[in-house]
């Protein structure tokens, strides 16, 4: 019988008392085969973290700073359930730390030196740890003691709770630095008042502070937010302009064998019976013998944290950077205006080899990081382990939802001004063998299908989106008799046709021979009835252009396209017979890396791009003998995006809507995790 006990960790007598009450009340409402509570008392949150890591306890609720400690080795805990605030319809699990300024003050984030600052309090998250952590490497050396470095960075401050004797500049704007509401500039509202009164130039608060203190929109319009990319935005655009997105209060558990499903089952049932306005005799979100015991009194309920989400992703790159800077106190030696090497994310073994050769030739400009799937690469870019990669439009969508931005687009047509002219896109097509003359778009049911990979544009999002509109369900593996769609569940019929050996079967990388455009076409040639690829795939792999044994004798004339009106056309007539226009692949990165990635990639393509004529004797960035490694092999150049510099603008309204419609069929664990952070 599986042990269905969750050992909750309590950090005080009062918490232990509430925990016992929680245990007893849960016993009375949950059947004997359901989850139960046991209580473990420890002296501190850090002791609780250690106890959970050592399997002496299972769960505890922590503030963001402690979630970071819990994630660090050797603890390796992960967030499993989040408290939410506000309403069930619009649950708030995060707040945003922001830098507020007056509209006419005219400076940016990188010009804060010498300004006057207003803080909620020394050591507090939004008011101190996050802004000072992010500014840490700009502080004058020596950076220890930190208060002295901050005092020398700003021309004057109000940082309540600071030592006014040792660091008088930190109390210059609020004499005495009082650590309570007796100090008019203490806390969120106080820090904002410090700005409003004209004492300071910038206030470090949370996004709701402005709304709580200024009910009138006209008054709010006198203020702006400083963004990390050295721009400003209106105060209601805090989701796109903040210092960090911070989780409010989170239940953590072990990463391995952590009982996360059981913890959720317990808490979900607990909120049903003892949540807000549910029961008189025991209330989960109430602390008669104290404040915020086990859970925050202001919480309204719980939400399950998506399983793909580790602590780094949950806390977010900015927050982790800020806290790591404060804790570790290390800064790069290079001046910050110089670009560090770009860490390119390579998918599995084959891309890594090409990336390595690029790295050797780039003379220190490119480093390589490996991951097994595109989603793992996106996650690495999000958390700073990698910086950039080129993605199919379907993954540009996921990366965009995860906060990454497109920076350059692959262009596939030769033109005089290639780098300045991003193209409209390529065509997604359905290819069949000419010999299967009865096959049309309208009778694909029961046929064998070949896809580039799940989540990619031409191979999945476009054809499956069109199919979904027809069949109104997501069971594509029942629609086709079998197929190869790398990235599908291994036991799915859409992995049956794949050719990878052992663990590589159906993997969404080049270890699966039927992965990508060339792979999907190979799948059609060898086993399938229809392949969903791009309009250039057939000509690129026929007529001897692909020397591989399976392709060297193929003839373009032996293949045809399926048109949406039920007719068929020759391959060269793709302009009048395609499923949709697809956005070109694009390079994505984090916002903070955008300028450097742009600069370094433009240098790299001038050295190793299409201008290199002999790829047998030179490194060529856009060649890998039909394998599309790192970039599509038909890339002519990487083009500037001009104003199409967000994922929505880049992909276009129509495509974003199409992928959005297919979201209900999504198996992307990363997309689920990212939409949890930003619904």
């Amino acid at each position: 019988v599986p042990d269905k006990t969750v050992r909750w960790c309590a950090v005080s007598e009062h918490e232990a008392t509430k925990c016992q009450s929680f245990r007893d009340h849960m016993k009375s409402v949950i059947p004997s085969d359901g989850p139960s509570v046991a209580c473990v008392k420890k002296a501190s949150y850090l002791d609780c973290i250690r106890a959970i890591a050592a399997n002496e306890a299972d769960a505890v609720t922590l503030d963001a700073g402690l979630v970071y400690d819990a994630y660090l080795a050797p603890n390796n805990l992960k967030p499993v359930v989040a408290e939410f605030y506000g309403s069930k319809e619009d649950p708030q699990t995060f707040y945003y730390a922001v830098a507020v300024v007056k509209k006419d003050s005219g400076f940016q984030m990188n010009q804060l030196r010498g300004k006057k600052s207003c803080h909620t309090g020394l050591g507090r998250s939004a008011g101190w740890n996050i802004p000072i952590g992010l500014l840490y490497c700009d502080l004058p050396e020596p950076r220890k003691p930190l208060e002295k470095a901050v005092a020398n960075f700003f021309s004057g401050s109000c940082a309540p709770c600071a030592d006014g004797t040792d660091f008088p500049q930190l109390c210059q704007l609020c004499p005495g630095c009082g650590c309570s509401t007796l100090n008019q500039y203490f806390g969120y509202s106080g820090a904002f008042k410090c700005l409003k009164d004209g004492a300071g130039d910038v206030a470090f608060v949370k996004h709701s502070t402005i709304f709580e203190n200024l009910a009138n929109k006209a008054d709010r319009d006198q203020y702006e937010l400083l963004c990390l990319d050295n721009t400003r935005k209106p105060v209601d655009e805090y989701k796109d302009c903040h210092l960090a997105q911070v989780p409010s209060h989170t239940v953590v558990a072990r990463s391995m064998g952590g009982k996360e499903d059981l913890i959720w089952e317990l808490l979900n049932q607990a909120q049903e019976h003892f949540g807000k306005d549910k029961s008189k005799e025991f209330q989960l979100f109430s602390s008669p013998h104290g404040k915020d015991l086990l859970f925050k009194d202001s919480a309204h309920g719980f939400l399950k944290v998506p399983p793909r989400m580790d602590a780094k992703m949950y806390l977010g790159y900015e927050y982790v950077t800020a806290i790591r800077n404060l804790r570790e106190g290390t800064c790069p030696e290079a001046p910050t205006d110089e670009c560090k090497p770009v860490k390119w994310c390579a998918l599995s073994h084959h891309e890594r080899l090409k990336c390595d050769e690029w790295s050797v030739n780039s003379v220190g400009k490119i480093e390589c990081v490996s991951a097994e799937t595109t989603e793992d690469c996106i996650a690495k870019i999000m958390n700073g382990e990698a910086d950039a990669m080129s993605l199919d439009g379907g993954f540009v969508y996921i990366a965009g939802k995860c906060g990454l931005v497109p920076v350059l687009a692959e262009n596939y047509n030769k033109s005089d001004n290639c780098e300045d002219t991003p193209e409209a896109g390529y065509f997604a097509i359905a290819v069949v063998k000419k010999s299967a003359s009865d096959l049309t778009w309208d009778n694909l049911k029961g046929k064998k299908s070949c896809h580039t990979a799940v989540g990619r544009t031409a191979g999945w999002n476009i054809p499956m989106g069109l199919l979904y509109n027809k069949i109104n369900h997501c069971r594509f593996d029942e629609f086709f008799s079998e197929g190869c769609a790398p990235g599908s569940k291994k036991d799915s019929s859409l992995c049956k046709l794949c050719m990878g050996s052992g663990l590589n079967l159906c993997e969404p990388n080049n270890k699966e021979g039927y992965y990508g455009y060339t792979g999907a076409f190979r799948c059609l040639v060898e086993k399938g009835d229809v392949a969903f690829v791009k309009h250039q795939t057939v000509p690129q792999n026929t007529g001897g252009k692909n020397p591989d044994p399976w392709a060297k004798n193929l003839n373009e004339k032996d293949y045809e396209l399926l048109c949406l009106d039920g007719t068929r056309k020759p391959v060269e007539e793709y302009a009048n017979c395609h499923l949709a226009r697809a956005p070109n692949h694009a390079v994505v990165t984090r916002k903070d890396k955008e300028a450097c990635v742009h600069k370094i990639l433009r240098q790299q393509q001038h050295l190793f791009g299409s201008n290199v004529t002999d790829c047998s004797g030179n490194f060529c960035l856009f060649r890998s003998e039909t394998k599309d490694l790192l970039f599509r092999d038909d890339t002519v150049c990487l083009a500037k995006l001009h104003d199409r510099n967000t994922y929505e603008k880049y992909l276009g309204e129509e495509y974003v809507k199409a992928v959005g419609n297919l979201r209900k069929c999504s198996t992307s664990s990363l997309l689920e995790a990212c939409t949890f952070r930003r619904p």
Partner: nanobody, 117 residues
Framework: EVQLVESGGGLVQPGGSLRLSCAAS????????MAWYRQAPGKGLELVAG???????KYADSVKGRFTISRDNSKNTLYLQMNSLRAEDTAVYYC???????????WGQGTLVTVSS
């Protein structure tokens, strides 16, 4: 296609030195990039050092300052001078000229380096 054969491996004590050679069956003068990789037991392949035709080099962080890659185009040979060897340098070492354009699943037999006291 040029064939590459690695040699020079062996058993050496920590702190010792070895020089690996990679002999090519044809001219390497026109080869853009050559590199040494290694595979430790139970681990994946990792780039140890690479060199371009023009002589620019790159090293893995773990070997910087200890290993030196060089090529002698007149002898059609790639070298890896390994000094201050450590136990964690134990691996099979392979050379590549990237001529199979990255998707080679074929590597030579390699040369085994064992660092142990």
């Amino acid at each position: 296609e040029v064939q590459l054969v690695e040699s020079g491996g062996g058993l050496v004590q920590p702190g010792g030195s070895l020089r690996l050679s990679c002999a090519a069956s044809g001219s390497i003068a026109s080869i853009a990039t050559m590199a040494w990789y290694r595979q430790a037991p139970g681990k994946g392949l990792e780039l140890v050092a690479g060199i371009t035709r023009g002589g620019s080099t790159k090293y893995a962080d773990s070997v910087k300052g200890r290993f030196t890659i060089s090529r002698d185009n007149s002898k059609n040979t790639l070298y890896l001078q390994m000094n201050s060897l450590r136990a964690e340098d134990t691996a099979v070492y392979y050379c590549t000229d990237y001529s199979r354009k990255y998707y080679q699943d074929y590597w030579g037999q390699g040369t085994l380096v064992t660092v142990s006291s």
